[in-house]
Interface confidence: low
């Protein structure tokens, strides 16, 4: 067969859809691989062809577009299932071609089952709400294009297994779910079920997302360095191990990068000719405030090392802070016999 630009299996787009629900899947070629859209390709005389490989099979086969009630159909660059079946799971390929040009990409489609409480192996998107921040909304995701704007669907919202009715601070408003004041107790999985008619049939779209209540920007502060501090002195003799923890608290900030690093004599440890190791651990509070600890370790410290400046730095979107550790060389304990002898004026 003639050469075709094969983009391979696009595992980045692991598409999951629920069994017995409509699914519309756009050919990824136009979204991620080619620099033109379907309309341009179509008007240039290119044809979009779909085929698939069933789960646990190697054989590529055409998609059957002649099923009863047009269960599977193609519309422009979209492959439609009305509805999906469990055995639709497999790798799907869309190929764009004419006599001189060919480009194709495959992607995995997994049809998953859900129980009556909407539990399933589906990977859930996470939506973060600020704690005690005033009205915030989540929107029923990925329902565009399933029905025309003239169709008015019914939308039912659930928290876990329970229909959201008469909840204190959570109000369904059509496609939106409003949180009057988000609290930790609002953490959980929220499901919208969109029901709409089409050609005498009724279809359901189920969309579940995880709500995570996080720290509010109203309460956000610059990083706080708990250690090193002015109360602890790292007093060591040459040859001992020097361990200095840098522990920093970061307020939750959406899309913020939290960074902690050490400098030794104003340089990054990598740029200093001493054998230093740094180990990091991270923990999170219930509202995703973060505590990072970086432990600076010098196995066998020298008297030169004990004269250096050790500074812990931290930064987030709220600012940058730094704190120096108090490091000093331990004064050797007096040798008792010599001291005593000297005290008695012995020669």
């Amino acid at each position: 067969s003639e050469r075709c630009d094969d983009w391979g299996l696009d595992t980045m787009r692991q598409i999951q859809v629920f069994e017995d629900e409509p699914a519309r899947i756009k050919c990824p070629l136009f979204e991620h691989f080619l620099k033109f859209n379907y309309s341009t390709a179509h008007s240039a005389g290119l044809t979009l062809i779909w085929y698939w490989t069933r789960q646990d099979r190697d054989l590529e086969e055409p998609i059957n577009f002649r099923l009863p009630e047009n269960r599977i159909s193609k519309e422009k660059d979209v492959l439609w299932f009305r509805p999906t079946l469990l055995n639709d799971t497999g790798n799907y390929t869309c190929m764009l071609r004419n006599t001189t040009y060919c480009s194709k990409v495959a992607f995995p489609l997994e049809v998953v089952q859900k129980d009556s409480c909407f539990n399933s192996p589906m990977k859930l998107p996470v939506h973060k709400l600020y704690i005690e921040y005033g009205i915030q909304r989540i929107t029923c995701p990925n329902v565009d294009g399933y029905f025309p704007s003239s169709v008015k669907p019914t939308i039912t919202w659930y928290m876990g297994c329970y229909k959201i009715q008469n909840f204190n601070n959570v109000i369904p408003e059509g496609m939106n779910l409003s949180f009057l004041i988000a609290l930790i107790s609002n953490n959980g999985n929220y499901t919208c079920v969109v029901t709409y008619p089409e050609n005498g049939r009724t279809f359901h779209l189920t969309r579940t997302l995880t709500v995570k209540v996080v720290g509010s920007p109203k309460n956000a502060v610059p990083p706080v360095i708990h250690s090193p501090n002015d109360h602890v002195v790292y007093e060591k003799e040459p040859g001992e191990e020097l361990l200095i923890p840098c522990t920093v608290y970061f307020s939750f900030l959406m899309d913020s990068r939290n960074e902690v690093w050490w400098t030794i004599d104003g340089k990054k440890p990598d740029d200093i000719t001493i054998d230093v190791t740094i180990n990091e651990s991270i923990s999170h509070s219930r509202t995703e405030d973060e505590t990072r600890t970086q432990i600076l370790s010098i196995k066998k410290v020298t008297s030169e090392d004990l004269k250096r400046s050790y500074v812990c730095h931290a930064r987030s979107a709220k600012g940058e802070v730094a704190k120096a550790a108090k490091v000093k060389q331990k004064v050797p304990a007096p040798r008792y016999t010599v001291e005593l002898a000297c005290g008695f004026g012995a020669t």
């Epitope: 920007p217 956000a220 959406m254 899309d255 939290n258 960074e259 930064r315 600012g319 940058e320």
Partner: antibody, heavy 123, light 112 residues
């Protein structure tokens, strides 16, 4: 959509003071730094300072310490700049400008600007 | 404080040609990943408008004929092809570290 609406032109006497306002809409006011920028006629741009509405934290250009005071009223989503002991050197257009918030390391760009307030200091 | 030096002070180019504006910082405004350098366009009687942030990120809605490059201390704004509506003064701006933020002196773009 994001809008920054500034107060109208001001004509004041030397030695007096003035308070310029900048009303924000279309975004969560308290989560973005608000900056003030000065531009004298035919001249370039000069950063005056910035304020973080959620905490009231301020930073000033050293040249404007004691000259400008930045405040906010979070109930009305309004930022203010109070200028004192005015001289002809303070005659300029003053802009408020928001910094895009979601980049760490203090690398904030001024992504939305008010239309500017013209201040004329003259006897 | 970081000083930004823009050049040239003014620039006249033919329509459809390339305009190149340079901005040099007195010290580095880059860290691993990106640079805290931004470019603005100011037309007569209007407030400045953000064109490019972090040296090369085109702001939403800005035509692709504008592009930015550079890191460390040396940065470039390119406009190609220049159109009549691009007549304006262009400013670079750094926002490195704890403010003090500064602007370049500006470059006035005219059409020949």
């Amino acid at each position: 959509h994001v809008q920054l609406q500034q107060s109208g032109p001001e004509l004041v006497r030397p030695g007096a003071s003035v308070k310029l306002s900048c009303k924000a809409s279309g975004y969560i006011f308290i989560t973005y730094w608000m900056n003030w920028v000065k531009q004298r006629p035919g001249q370039g741009l000069e950063w005056v300072g910035q304020i973080f509405p959620a905490s009231g934290t301020t930073y000033y250009n050293e040249l404007f310490e004691g000259k400008a005071t930045l405040t906010v009223d979070t109930s009305s989503n309004t930022a203010y700049m109070h200028l004192t002991s005015l001289t002809s050197e303070d005659s300029a257009v003053y802009y408020c400008a928001r910094t895009d918030f979601y980049r760490y390391d203090g690398g904030y760009a001024l992504d939305y600007w008010g239309q500017g307030t013209s201040l004329t200091v003259s006897s | 404080d970081i000083v930004l030096t823009q050049s040239p002070i003014s620039l006249a180019v033919f329509l459809g040609q390339r305009a190149t504006i340079s901005c040099r910082a007195s010290q580095s405004v880059s860290t691993s990943g990106y640079s805290s350098m931004h470019w603005y366009q100011q037309k007569a009687g209007q407030p400045p408008k953000l064109l490019i942030k972090y040296a090369s990120d085109l702001e939403s809605g800005v035509p692709v004929r504008f592009s930015g490059s550079g890191s460390g201390t040396d940065f470039i704004l390119n406009i190609h092809p220049v159109e009549v509506e691009d007549i304006a003064t262009y400013y670079c701006h750094h926002s490195w570290g704890i403010p003090m933020y500064t602007f370049g002196g500006g470059t006035k773009l005219e059409i020949k």
